[in-house]
């Protein structure tokens, strides 16, 4: 798994809806792969972390003034939907094919 | 200024192009306001940090398993351009009105 010393990357994060209290309205699945963005945004920022110009600038400033300015942060830059079966307002089980923004597709330095 | 105990917010970050070695091609300005996103993404995530569903999920998982999963990160969610004067291939000073993605417009939790 990606620790603090690793470069920014996508790692597994299995989320159980019961653990976060969402099992009251999400019927299925019981858990899903959310993924997590882990690791550092170290100089030089590689192309695969798709850095913005601001992230590049911040990285360079951090290099010169490490106590004054933080590194860029490894975060989801593209998210994917999942399909969920949930109870609507009337308690009717309903399938939402695209419940957007629930799973990490790509990580990057921002 | 926003420390680790503060909520995610936009703070000032003056960047001098000489400090980051970009003065070799950016003639002017000598420095600019880049801003920086600083502070924590604490539960509950407020609307003003425009959290994605994944950020909300990750925050809830972090709340239950703080050593296993990190908090969401405070990062630029919208960037603004700046204008720069640079030398082209012929050494001609040229103005780029919109050098994109150089300054933070908005911060959020991702």
């Amino acid at each position: 798994s990606a620790g603090a010393g690793s470069h920014c990357q996508k790692t597994s994060l299995r989320v159980n809806f019961e653990d976060i209290g969402w099992d009251s309205w999400i019927i299925a699945p019981k858990e899903y792969e959310a993924y997590e963005c882990k690791g550092g945004c170290f100089f030089p920022l590689a192309d695969d972390v798709t850095p913005t110009k601001h992230a590049i600038v911040q990285t360079l400033v951090h290099l010169k003034f490490p106590t004054k300015v933080g590194k860029a942060c490894c975060v989801p830059t593209k998210l994917s939907p999942i399909s969920v079966l949930y109870k609507d307002d009337m308690g009717v089980p309903t399938l939402k094919y695209h419940y957007e923004g629930m799973s990490v597709a790509e990580c990057g330095c921002r | 200024s926003a420390g680790a105990g503060s909520h995610c917010q936009k703070t000032s970050l003056r960047v001098n192009f000489e400090d980051i070695g970009w003065d070799s091609w950016i003639i002017a300005p000598k420095e600019y306001e880049a801003y920086e996103c600083k502070g924590g993404c604490f539960f509950p995530l407020a609307d003003d940090v425009t959290p994605t569903k994944h950020a909300i999920v990750q925050t809830l998982v972090h709340l239950k398993f703080p050593t296993k999963v990190g908090k969401a990160c405070c990062v630029p969610t919208k960037l603004s351009p700046i204008s720069v004067l640079y030398k082209d291939d012929m050494g001609v000073p040229t103005l780029k009105y919109h050098y994109e993605g150089m300054s933070v417009a908005e911060c959020g939790c991702r």
């Epitope: - | 000598k30 700046i82 004067l85 001609v92 000073p93 103005l95």
Partner: antibody, heavy 119, light 111 residues
Framework: EVQLVESRGGLVQPGGSMRLSCAAS????????MNWVRQAPGKGLEWVAH??????????HYAESVRGRFTISRDDSKNSVYLQMNSLKTEDTGVYYC??????????WGQGTLVTVSS | DIVMTQSPDSLAVSLGERATINCRAS??????????MNWFQQKPGQPPKLLIY???NQGSGVPDRFSGSGSGTDFTLTISSLQAEDVAVYFC?????????FGQGTKLEIK
């Protein structure tokens, strides 16, 4: 080596017309704004007109003193810029310089050509 | 239009001495943290040559004795040690707004 060579000017009567041309070499012509700047005898410099790039739809701008009488144009395939001058006045007399540059500065200059408007 | 006014109109300086030419704009020529101010040198019978751009940056091949300073509305061209080949007319010019305008020129001679 960058070169801008203006066509020969000459003498023209008030109310008459003249067309100046400028041939460019030594740089990627289509990447640069082209301008005409003039200098009355013993006087200062006056920007006359400029023409921008294809990406700007060849937008043109003129000094108030020549607007409606002068027309700037360019032919990127011939690396040339032109200045069509109509309804010439005695105060249009001077050396006309072809200049190339960016949206910030006059970088390249021709040697200039003398236009004399007199009866 | 932005009016550029130079002072003095003419200047006589001894060889090796410092020459200073001023230029004042009728309104600020700064924007985006950039000064839209250039200086040109014109020797007799020649076209103008870019000397200083963005208020303080030397043009290509310009000797170090030429320097520029200033911001907003007030700018200065300085020749630290006048040489014989510096005899010329010097023009300031703004490119912040169309029409791009020049100062009236300062004639520099040797005393």
């Amino acid at each position: 080596e960058v070169q801008l060579v203006e066509s020969r000017g000459g003498l023209v009567q008030p109310g008459g017309s003249m067309r100046l041309s400028c041939a460019a070499s030594g740089f990627t012509f289509s990447n640069y704004w082209m301008n005409w700047v003039r200098q009355a005898p013993g006087k200062g410099l006056e920007w006359v007109a400029h023409i921008r790039l294809k990406s700007d739809n060849y937008a043109t701008h003129y000094a108030e003193s020549v607007r409606g009488r002068f027309t700037i144009s360019r032919d990127d395939s011939k690396n040339s810029v032109y200045l069509q001058m109509n309804s010439l006045k005695t105060e249009d007399t001077g050396v006309y310089y072809c200049t190339g540059g960016s949206n910030y500065v006059f970088a390249f200059w021709g040697q200039g050509t003398l236009v004399t408007v007199s009866s | 239009d932005i009016v550029m006014t130079q002072s003095p109109d003419s200047l006589a300086v001894s060889l090796g001495e410092r020459a200073t030419i001023n230029c004042r704009a009728s309104e600020s020529v700064d924007n985006y943290g950039i000064s839209f101010m250039n200086w040109f040198q014109q020797k007799p019978g020649q076209p103008p040559k870019l000397l200083i751009y963005a208020a303080s940056n030397q043009g290509s091949g310009v000797p170090d004795r030429f320097s520029g300073s200033g911001s907003g509305t007030d700018f200065t061209l300085t020749i630290s040690s006048l040489q014989a080949e510096d005899v010329a007319v010097y023009f300031c010019q703004q490119s912040k707004e169309v029409p791009w305008t020049f100062g009236q020129g300062t004639k520099l001679e040797i005393k």
